[in-house]
Amino acid sequence: MKVLQEPACVSDYMSISTCEWKMGGPTNCSAELRLLYQLVFQSSETHTCVPENNGGVGCVCHLLMDDVVSMDNYTLDLWAGQQLLWKGSFKPSEHVKPRAPGNLTVHTNVSDTVLLTWSNPYPPDNYLYNDLTYAVNIWSENDPAYSRIHNVTYLKPTLRIPASTLKSGISYRARVRAWAQHYNTTWSEWSPSTKWYNSYREPFEQR
């Protein structure tokens, strides 16, 4: 049994780090492998993560962690029974992938404006809470050529779009993702998309 692609881990800077790797051949990850992790800290104990399959040769493990601080460093040991396949370390603060924003909602009852709101995925006491900026992707299912990214660089999780900039009488979808500039994170996954119908019509005089 051999590791083809070493574990690569990212932290959500809250309570979970996700490690993914590839094996040299088809593997029943949960039955054959264990990822042991331990915080380098006084009197810490070793904890075990049971991996799941992620494709034929891929494995993924979700490591439960405490709130992340910059000093935290973990040792990682990948075992197949009594055989140590790989040994490494992981500093969560240096490999952050934020949680995806949630509760994306479209409000079309605001005059001349489409208002999109979503929720910050972190509680106020988390360091990332006040550091997230967002990208909102809006596209049309009726017009494949239409796709826009709106960068939201302010803290408030809202975006206002003049309804007149969207075609009337067709459906649109939106999704949002986040990143934290000061923590040099990757982008989060996209939120689930939400759909709405743009029924806005310009006043008669402007037609």
Epitope: L39, F41, Q42, S43, S44, E45, T46, H47, L64, M65, D66, V69, S70, M71, D72
Partner: antibody, heavy 125, light 112 residues
Framework: EVQLVESGGGLEQPGGSLRLSCAGS????????MTWVRQAPGKGLEWVSS????????YYADSVKGRFTISRDNSKNTLYLQMNSLRAEDTAVYYC??????????????????WGQGTTVTVSS | DIVMTQSPLSLPVTPGEPASISCTAS???????????VDWYLQKSGQSPQLLIY???KRASGVPDRFSGSGSGTDFTLKISRVEAEDVGFYYC?????????FGQGTKLEIK
């Protein structure tokens, strides 16, 4: 009531051995790291050894490394310190103390918040 | 090893007056914001040490509020707002960031 009671101290000749015990009660013993601290006559406090809650990690002062062994039996709620190759400078009152919660991912620290009454070890010929 | 240096080593105080003991670590004891791994202990004559303050400024259960801890990084202070006769004994700071845990030399507080 949370309590630690040491035993096993006594008079021993240089080169001899002693085994100290520390019985814990009133708390979930296995979830806590435990620590031994000693105090030579008329001197200050000196850390000796610590052990994680599951016994997998042990730590020793340089002055006792290779001679002392810390262990625990969580089924008996008891901490041990096996002292071999004793020297005159090991003469001290030995205290066990309740240390941090070590079963959490990052151990939670509340100080050495419970101490035993101490047991006296005298090494003399 | 982290060296803990306490001062003063002797502290005569009049009852009702404040008292202050300082402790300096040879390296930072700050692990993360608000978590300085330094404790203060009092050992009364013929007794086991008792915890007063942990993590730099958190008062242990049952400790009178006249005791307070402050400081961050390498410099820490134990303050007693109004010394009482029962406060006499040796006071020790201790770092618990990493083994070997190390204690200060001890400060003997006595009543004038």
């Amino acid at each position: 009531e949370v309590q630690l009671v040491e035993s096993g101290g006594g008079l021993e000749q240089p080169g001899g051995s002693l085994r100290l015990s520390c019985a814990g009660s009133g708390f979930t013993f296995r979830t806590y790291a435990m620590t031994w601290v000693r105090q030579a006559p008329g001197k200050g406090l000196e850390w000796v050894s610590s052990i994680s809650g599951d016994g997998s990690n042990t730590y020793y002062a340089d002055s006792v490394k290779g001679r002392f062994t810390i262990s625990r039996d969580n089924s008996k709620n008891t901490l041990y310190l096996q002292m071999n190759s004793l020297r005159a400078e090991d003469t001290a009152v030995y205290y066990c103390a309740k240390d941090r919660v070590s079963i959490t991912i990052r151990p939670r620290y509340y100080g050495l918040d419970v101490w035993g009454q101490g047991t006296t070890v005298t090494v003399s010929s | 090893d982290i060296v803990m240096t306490q001062s003063p080593l002797s502290l005569p105080v009049t009852p009702g007056e404040p008292a202050s003991i300082s402790c300096t670590a040879s390296q930072s004891l700050l692990y993360s914001i608000g978590y300085n791994y330094v404790d203060w202990y009092l050992q009364k004559s013929g007794q086991s040490p008792q915890l007063l303050i942990y993590l730099g400024n958190k008062r242990a259960s049952g400790v009178p509020d006249r005791f307070s801890g402050s400081g961050s990084g390498t410099d820490f202070t134990l303050k007693i707002s109004r010394v009482e006769a029962e406060d006499v004994g040796f006071y020790y700071c201790m770092q618990a960031l990493t083994t070997p845990y190390t204690f200060g030399q001890g400060t003997k507080l006595e009543i004038k």
